[in-house]
Structure formats: structure tokens, C-alpha cells
Interface confidence: low
């Protein structure tokens, strides 16, 4: 069993809440902060000691249709001489995001929320060495 | 999911765009994303650009808890375990979609919200600006 989450609010349904059929929820997909822009340092994917490339995945039955995934370029990390150092590891950093999936069943359509794991970039780590007895 | 009947003659009336408001199933697919168990989760400590994770909690949002990364150093950790200020630790940021309760406090009514999170840090060669 789950212990109650600290700070969890058991929502008292206000009168203004829209009626929703059982087992479903109403979702407005007009995005709040739609025009917010990422202000990351310039070209960090190329300047990183664990550089990465981006691939855009496209799915018309997903909202948003476009999801960008990063892939580490190397197994090792780039040293000060610009060479790959395989004593260190480039590893992916991942983050979950939500998408809306549209499903077709004959002449009907349904919508499902889905968690997607996005690789956002890479970082250089010291490897874990497992010693075998 | 919740099935919505399409217009008669639906093969020709396929709408390429998503409607502004949809009814979605309460069950979230991949809710417990089963990431590779062999992937170590201590990158934040082992990275040459280590970071701390700060908890951001908001009961009006799903997921209610999001972790924000903050780089520990301006520089990066070198082979001797010291901070090398010739390199920079920088945050990797990502826009993610979350659900915001709308109207507030309603249990089953949400709006998508885009938020910017720092997921981790990476070590980069600095851009050096030479002043004439």
C-alpha cells in the first residue's frame, strides 16, 4: 500500500469543475507557456566533453508530433587534446515528458496520455568498475 | 481510451489536427516507465560536471514532483578530483509537458503546460570572448 504523500491535497471538487465521464479526464491541449524558449548555452552539444547529436522523431498521431532525442557521439569522453578518452564514459541524461496519443479504432478515435522518456543530452562520468571475485 | 465517434463517412473526414480539448483515459500509458535497470542513476555524483537535485512540488500539477538540477561548480572536475576552471559546467535544459489543473483544484480537468527543467549538467569548453 502507498503511504499518503506529504503535502498531497485531497481535492475538494469546486462547483466550477466541468462534468467529466467516469474513467476519463478533460484535457485542454492549448499549451500554457507555448512560446517559452530554451536559453541553453550556445552549441553545448558540440562543445561538451561528451558531445551528442539530435534526431527529430515525427508522429502525426502524437501531440506534440515532434520529439527531439539526443544520442551521445562517443562511448568515451573528449579530452583536452580533442581525442576520445575511453577511461571515461559519455552517458545519456534522460527526462520524462507527457504526450497525447491519438488511437484509431475503425471509424472512432480515442486519446491516451503517455509518458515518453527523452534523452536530452550527455554527460561525462567516471565509470563504475565491478570487481569480480 | 475514451472513444469518440467520428463523422459519418469518416474515411474522408480525417482531421489532421488535434482538437483543442480532448477526453483522455485516466490511466497514463508507461506510467511507471521501466528504464534499463543496469543504467546507473548516480550520474549526478560521478559526472565531471556534477549536480545537485532540488525537489519542486506543486499539487496543482501532474507530475506533482519534478527534480531540478543545479550544477555544483562553475568549472569541471579533472582527473585529480579538483575543479578545473578552464572548463565550464553548464545545465542541460529541456522543455517538458506537464498537466496543470484547470480550473484550479479540479480533480479531472487539466491543461497541458510547457515547463523548462534543468535535467543535469555537462562539461563544455568555454567560449572565450577576446576584447579588442
Amino acid at each position: 500500500r502507498k503511504i499518503p504523500k506529504v503535502g498531497h491535497t485531497f481535492f475538494q471538487k469546486p462547483e466550477s469543475c466541468p462534468p467529466v465521464p467516469g474513467g476519463s479526464m478533460k484535457l485542454d491541449i492549448g499549451i500554457i507557456n507555448e512560446n517559452q524558449r530554451v536559453s541553453m548555452s550556445r552549441n553545448i552539444e558540440s562543445r561538451s566533453t561528451s558531445p551528442w547529436n539530435y534526431t527529430v522523431t515525427w508522429d502525426p498521431n502524437r501531440y506534440p508530433s515532434e520529439v527531439v532525442q539526443a544520442q551521445c557521439r562517443n562511448l568515451g569522453c573528449i579530452n583536452a587534446q580533442g581525442k576520445e578518452d575511453i577511461s571515461m564514459n559519455s552517458v545519456p541524461i534522460q527526462q520524462e515528458t507527457l504526450v497525447v496519443r491519438r488511437k484509431h479504432q475503425g471509424c472512432s478515435v480515442s486519446f491516451q496520455l503517455e509518458k515518453v522518456l527523452v534523452t536530452v543530452g550527455c554527460t561525462c562520468v567516471t565509470p563504475v568498475i565491478h570487481h569480480v571475485q | 481510451g475514451i472513444t469518440i465517434p467520428r463523422n459519418p463517412g469518416c474515411p474522408n473526414s480525417e482531421d489532421k489536427n488535434f482538437p483543442r480539448t480532448v477526453m483522455v483515459n485516466l490511466n497514463i500509458h508507461n506510467r511507471n516507465t521501466n528504464t534499463n535497470p543496469k543504467r546507473s542513476s548516480d550520474y549526478y555524483n560521478r559526472s565531471t560536471s556534477p549536480w545537485n537535485l532540488h525537489r519542486n512540488e506543486d499539487p496543482e500539477r501532474y507530475p506533482s514532483v519534478i527534480w531540478e538540477a543545479k550544477c555544483r561548480h562553475l568549472g569541471c572536475i579533472n582527473a585529480d578530483g579538483n575543479v578545473d576552471y578552464h572548463m565550464n559546467s553548464v545545465p542541460i535544459q529541456q522543455e517538458i509537458l506537464v498537466l496543470r489543473r484547470e480550473p484550479p483544484h479540479c480533480p479531472n480537468s487539466f491543461r497541458l503546460e510547457k515547463i523548462l527543467v534543468s535535467v543535469g549538467c555537462t562539461c563544455v569548453t568555454p567560449i572565450v570572448h577576446h576584447v579588442a
Epitope: - | 534499463n36 506533482s64 527534480w67
Partner: nanobody, 122 residues
């Protein structure tokens, strides 16, 4: 669903030791963790071990003092607590989760035991 039963809590003096056990039955898991909740405080991650037993994770506050381990069958997970401090006083829960990414996020644990009280007196 995984059923979890904790034992081994109790009252101990500062500097003393306790060994908590958590017996699991049911489906497999990717990680089992110990989490604790002190009165009036948030639930916090203490330690976790992967299903294979290869990987262990500790909160900074217990590193070097606490050791998480499991038996060969993977049915029981232990938390050996040494050099206990009064601030370790809390209800200790064992819980399972899927995935090893961000094991310290207590919200990601799915199945919880009933908890065992650990009190450290000064």
C-alpha cells in the same frame, strides 16, 4: 503486487546499531529501497539496492554508516544501521520500484510496507 513486511525496529542509544529486515513476496522488482519519515518531516530516501544486487545507492546523510544488502534468493533486503544518531529517529519503510533512474525520488516507489519505528535516544 509485492507484499512487504518490515521488522527489526526498536529503541537504541546513540552510537548503537540496528538491523532492519524487509521480506518481499510477489512479483519481481528493479529496486528495493528503504525510506524514512520523521514526525512532521517529509518522507526521505535512505538507501536502495537493485534487483540483481549489483548496485546500491545511499543518501549522503547515511553513507558510511548504513549498509543495504539482500539474501541470495532476493526475498529479504536488510538495512544494517551503525553509529546511529538521534536524527535517524523515524518510521522506516521498505518499498519497491521499477527502474533505477532517480532512485531517491520517494514518489516513484510503488509498493510499501507498513513501516517499523526506529528511535535513537541521546
Amino acid at each position: 503486487e509485492v507484499q512487504l513486511v518490515e521488522s527489526g525496529g526498536g529503541l537504541v542509544q546513540a552510537g548503537g546499531s540496528l538491523r532492519l529486515s524487509c521480506a518481499a513476496s510477489g512479483r519481481t522488482y528493479d529496486a528495493m529501497g528503504w525510506l524514512r519519515q520523521a514526525p512532521g518531516k517529509e518522507r526521505e530516501f535512505v538507501a536502495a539496492i537493485s534487483g540483481s544486487g549489483d548496485d546500491t545507492y545511499y543518501a549522503d546523510s547515511v553513507k558510511g554508516r548504513f549498509t543495504i544488502s539482500k539474501d541470495n534468493a532476493g526475498i529479504t533486503v536488510y538495512l544494517q544501521m551503525n553509529s546511529l544518531k538521534p536524527e535517524d529517529t523515524a518510521v522506516y519503510y521498505c518499498a519497491t520500484r521499477r527502474g533505477l533512474y532517480y532512485v531517491w525520488d520517494s514518489n516513484d516507489y510503488e509498493n510499501w510496507g507498513q513501516g517499523t519505528q526506529v528511535t535513537v535516544s541521546s
